[in-house]
C-alpha cells in the first residue's frame, strides 16, 4: 500500500505508455495568424 503526493515531473515521454506529452523545452511561442 502507498499514498504519495509524488514530486514535480519535468521529463519528456520515454515509453509508449508513459502518458506524458512531449513538452519540449526549446519550443517557442508563436502568435497564430
Amino acid at each position: 500500500s502507498e499514498t504519495t503526493t509524488g514530486t514535480s515531473s519535468n521529463s519528456s515521454q520515454s515509453t509508449s505508455n508513459s502518458g506524458l506529452a512531449p513538452n519540449p523545452t526549446n519550443a517557442t511561442t508563436k502568435a497564430a495568424g
Epitope: T5, G6, S8, S9, G19, P22, N23, P24, T29
Partner: antibody, heavy 117, light 113 residues
Framework: DVQLKESGPALVKPTQTLTLTCTVT?????????WHWIRQPPGKALEWMGY???????RYNPSLKTRLTISRDTSKNQFVLTMTNMDPVDTATYFC??????????WGQGTTVTVSS | DIVMTQSPLSLPVTPGEPASISCRSS????????????LTWYLQKPGQSPQLLIS???TRASGVPDRFSGSGSGTDFTLKISRVEAEDVGVYYC?????????FGGGTKLEIK
C-alpha cells in the same frame, strides 16, 4: 475495460478544502500512463488541472498549483485531488481521466461540485 | 500557455450534410522529433463526459466512425464530418497535448437544424 469513477462531496463551503477520489478499475495506476483531473464550470470549456504519473510524479496547472495536490492510494487503485481554499468560482463538474502520450482516452462520468455558503 | 481558438461557436447542420470545425493554436503543435502534431479532438455529448475522437491531428480513435476526419498541421487544424447524423450533436473540443499546461479550445456546439 478501463473505467474511472469520481466520488466526493457535492457541496463545499467557501474557504473549505475539497477532496475528490477517482477509483480506477480494469487497469493498475502504477502500471503506466498519467492520471489526470480536469474540470468544467457550468456552460464553460474544459480546464486541465494536473496529473499524477504511474511513477508517482506529479504536475499541476500553474494557475492552480498553490492550492492543488494530487496523490494516490495504490492499495485501492485510486488517485485523489485535494484543493484548498475553495471559492464559488471553483463550482464545476470535475472529471478524472487517463492520459496517454497523445490524448485522454478514458474519462470518468464527472462529479458536480458546488461551492456555496 | 498555448491558446486554442475554435470556430464557429455554434454550428447548425442538416442531417446528411457535411460539417467543418476549425481550431487554431497560438503556437505550433508539430513536434520536430517525431513529426507528429499533438492536437486532439473530443466530443462531449449532452450530459456526458468528453469522448476521444481524434489524436495526433488525424488518427481516429477506436470505434469512431470514418465519417469523422481530422487534418491540419502546425497551428491550423480542421475536424470534418462528412455526413452529420443526429447522434453527432454535442460540443466539440480541440486540445493541445504538446506543452504543459494542457489547454482546450472553447468548444463548438453542433446542433441539428
Amino acid at each position: 475495460d478501463v473505467q474511472l469513477k469520481e466520488s466526493g462531496p457535492a457541496l463545499v463551503k467557501p474557504t473549505q478544502t475539497l477532496t475528490l477520489t477517482c477509483t480506477v478499475t480494469g487497469y493498475s495506476i502504477t502500471s503506466g500512463y498519467t492520471w489526470h483531473w480536469i474540470r468544467q464550470p457550468p456552460g464553460k470549456a474544459l480546464e486541465w488541472m494536473g496529473y499524477i504519473q504511474y511513477t508517482g510524479s506529479t504536475r499541476y496547472n500553474p494557475s492552480l498549483k498553490t492550492r492543488l495536490t494530487i496523490s494516490r492510494d495504490t492499495s485501492k487503485n485510486q488517485f485523489v485531488l485535494t484543493m484548498t481554499n475553495m471559492d464559488p468560482v471553483d463550482t464545476a463538474t470535475y472529471f478524472c481521466a487517463r492520459g496517454t502520450t497523445a490524448s485522454f482516452d478514458y474519462w470518468g462520468q464527472g462529479t458536480t461540485v458546488t461551492v456555496s455558503s | 500557455d498555448i491558446v486554442m481558438t475554435q470556430s464557429p461557436l455554434s454550428l447548425p447542420v442538416t442531417p446528411g450534410e457535411p460539417a467543418s470545425i476549425s481550431c487554431r493554436s497560438s503556437q505550433s503543435l508539430l513536434y520536430s522529433s517525431d513529426q507528429k502534431n499533438y492536437l486532439t479532438w473530443y466530443l462531449q455529448k449532452p450530459g456526458q463526459s468528453p469522448q476521444l475522437l481524434i489524436s495526433w491531428a488525424s488518427t481516429r480513435a477506436s470505434g469512431v466512425p470514418d465519417r469523422f476526419s481530422g487534418s491540419g498541421s502546425g497551428t491550423d487544424f480542421t475536424l470534418k464530418i462528412s455526413r452529420v447524423e443526429a447522434e453527432d450533436v454535442g460540443v466539440y473540443y480541440c486540445q493541445q497535448y504538446f506543452i504543459y499546461p494542457l489547454t482546450f479550445g472553447g468548444g463548438t456546439k453542433l446542433e441539428i437544424k
